[in-house]
């Protein structure tokens, strides 16, 4: 599990159609 102090920071991954975008790229979400 993530440490408590990390919980408000996003995790970033490559994906397609993520982060309200139609193409492929990096997407960071909490």
């Amino acid at each position: 599990r993530r440490r408590r102090r990390d919980t408000h920071f996003p995790i970033c991954i490559f994906c397609c159609g993520c982060c309200h975008r139609s193409k492929c790229g990096m997407c960071c979400k909490t």
């Epitope: 982060c19 790229g25 960071c28």
Partner: antibody
Framework: QVQLVESGGGVVQPGRSLRLSCAAS????????MHWVRQAPGKGLEWVAV????????YYADSVKGRFTISRDNSKNTLYLQMNSLRAEDTAVYYC??????????????WGQGTMVTVSS | YELTQPPSVSVSPGQTASITCSGD??????ASWYQQKPGQSPILVIY???KRPSGIPERFSGSNSGNTATLTISGTQAMDEADYYC??????????FGGGTKLTVL
Amino acid sequence: QVQLVESGGGVVQPGRSLRLSCAASGFTFSNYGMHWVRQAPGKGLEWVAVIWYVGSNKYYADSVKGRFTISRDNSKNTLYLQMNSLRAEDTAVYYCARAQEGMAPDAFDIWGQGTMVTVSS
Amino acid sequence: YELTQPPSVSVSPGQTASITCSGDKMGERYASWYQQKPGQSPILVIYQDTKRPSGIPERFSGSNSGNTATLTISGTQAMDEADYYCQAWYSSTNVVFGGGTKLTVL
């Protein structure tokens, strides 16, 4: 103003280690992903590694995986690149670069001036 | 993955320069473009295919569809002479730069 300043480069023998630093100023360092990108003499740009907001969320190019380690100290506004088992082909100018702000940080919007690493016997 | 750029492009002052960046399904991912002058660090000129960072002149524009992204410089000026690199993500561990294009303003 927004600035990235690399240091720690130099001449090192094959198989040895070196640690690069990148001091950030003028922005909230912890709010940005940070990259290392290198450029061999007379050649193009090559991505090396990225570390995102959480220190455990990091990725490496295949060419350096297992030899290089990217890390950050948000309290010191500093990015690091620990380079072990150096090879002649690692000779390059090493740039630190800031990832764009926001949910979709595809591009590198701020670059440092670079620090030269020469691996030679 | 590879992104292929022409090694060099020449243009007369005031004319339009187009620099291409070709790669497998390039149009399905976001392209960024960087300008690098001799002895200097790269500068971001286009991101997310078509967007210009603040401070970048309007003469710089971009497009991306099919297998090719294109950087267009309209009304090219002498100060635009530089190397230009495209860049795209292919996975979380695979950021790819093109080989670079040397733009010469004749």
